[in-house]
């Protein structure tokens, strides 16, 4: 079926925006005014996984770029990465596992769960500045909660 | 050589409730997601809900209220309860293997057991 | 969620006969059509998954066409073991639907 998507940026629990950070990296800060216009726009595709009633299975891309969130093994750890794809073949239905995450919707705040490492989150951290990547801790140091705000197509 | 066989039906009064077992072998079910199905005397199949291999649950929203699919990796089973029954419930209840092939196909089912009978009646 | 409308729910054929059982969903479903062999007492045998694709060691005078919404199950050339119920399963999305069934009985 054709994949359904809808476009939105993401904030962290305190309010930090994703921007890009080089080509292949996103990191989380505090953003205000004209410079709102840098944060990062996804395209947020709707695609099979192990879906239960309480978590739906997504893709993140980056609007208009060919690049997806991805979890993948690296020195051992699973990592967040930004992997580049054709575009003639994504977004699809049926995305490779590393590119799905289970989103999970507690409180009015959302989390995303690596579907290709349970419990493995996408994360940020307190400081200002830094990377955005994949974390194995909930309820730590760690932020793991976003808010999600849509973006008119 | 792939086997799901159900267990633990017969007559139950209405109000009631039930546990269905579904032993597996051929297949770990920590990698594969299984699924009920039941069929109502003389009637079509009615998908249920499933238990994925990470234990994650999705039910069809009718019987969400009624139903509870969980399972032991370890003794290689699946289990159904289903609570407040009545009549209507009265069918063969199948489980069934998810193919789990990310990317291809999630969802269909291969495997079926061979069914066990519940009937609901005072 | 998806509902699919099969027909016919009977249909009375011969031995030899070629049968066509159809599936309409009312959504998208891109080629997740399943199609299920069922005789009674026994329960669903999967005849052809999703994508058109015949399973192993199913006779090849089973065959299934379709993507989108319509979809075509087809027996070319009947044989007596072939009276039963087919069932057509959309597995593109859950909850997972099936068709009402098609009750093929000898003419």
């Known amino acids: 079926a054709p994949v359904r998507s809808l476009n939105c940026t993401l904030r962290d629990s305190q309010q930090k925006s994703l921007v890009m950070s080089g080509p292949y990296e996103l990191k989380a800060l505090h953003l205000q005014g004209q410079d709102m216009e840098q944060q990062v726009v996804f395209s947020m595709s709707f695609v099979q996984g192990e879906e239960s009633n309480d978590k739906i299975p997504v893709a993140l891309g980056l609007k208009e770029k060919n690049l997806y969130l991805s979890c993948v093994l690296k020195d051992d750890k699973p990592t967040l990465q930004l992997e580049s794809v054709d575009p003639k073949n994504y977004p699809k239905k049926k995305m490779e596992k590393r590119f799905v995450f289970n989103k999970i919707e507690i409180n009015n705040k959302l989390e995303f769960e690596s579907a290709q490492f349970p419990n493995w989150y996408i994360s940020t951290s307190q400081a200002e500045n830094m990377p955005v990547f994949l974390g194995g801790t909930k309820g730590g140091q760690d932020i793991t909660d976003f808010t999600m705000q849509f973006v008119s197509s | 050589e792939v086997q799901l066989v159900e267990s633990g039906g017969g007559l139950v009064q209405p109000g009631g409730s039930l546990r269905l077992s579904c032993a597996v072998s051929?297949?770990?079910?920590?990698?594969?997601?299984v699924s009920w199905i039941r069929q109502a005397p003389g009637k079509g199949l009615e998908w249920l809900g499933l238990?994925?291999?990470?234990?994650?649950?999705y039910y069809n929203s009718p019987l969400k209220s009624r139903l509870t699919i969980s399972k032991d990796n370890s003794k290689s089973t699946v289990y159904l309860q289903m609570n407040s029954l009545r009549a209507e419930d009265t069918a063969v209840y199948y489980c069934a293997k998810q193919r789990t092939l990310w990317g291809y196909d999630l969802y269909g089912m291969d495997y079926w057991g061979q069914g066990t009978l519940v009937t609901v009646s005072s | 969620e998806t509902t699919v409308t099969q027909s016919p729910s009977s249909l009375s054929a011969s031995v030899g006969d070629r049968v066509t059982i159809t599936c309409i969903t009312s959504t998208d479903i891109d080629v997740d059509m399943n199609w299920y062999q069922q005789k009674p007492g026994k329960p669903p045998k999967l005849l052809i998954s999703?994508?058109?694709t015949l399973r192993p060691g199913v006779p090849s005078r089973f065959s299934s066409s379709g993507s989108g919404t319509d979809f075509t199950f087809t027996i070319s050339s009947l044989q007596p073991e072939d009276f039963a119920t087919y069932y057509c399963l959309q597995s593109d999305n859950l909850p997972l639907t099936f068709g009402q069934g098609t009750k093929l009985e000898i003419k």
């Open positions: 051929g297949f770990t079910l920590s990698d594969y997601g």
């Open positions: 999703q994508g058109n």
């Open positions: 238990i994925w291999g990470g234990g994650d649950t």
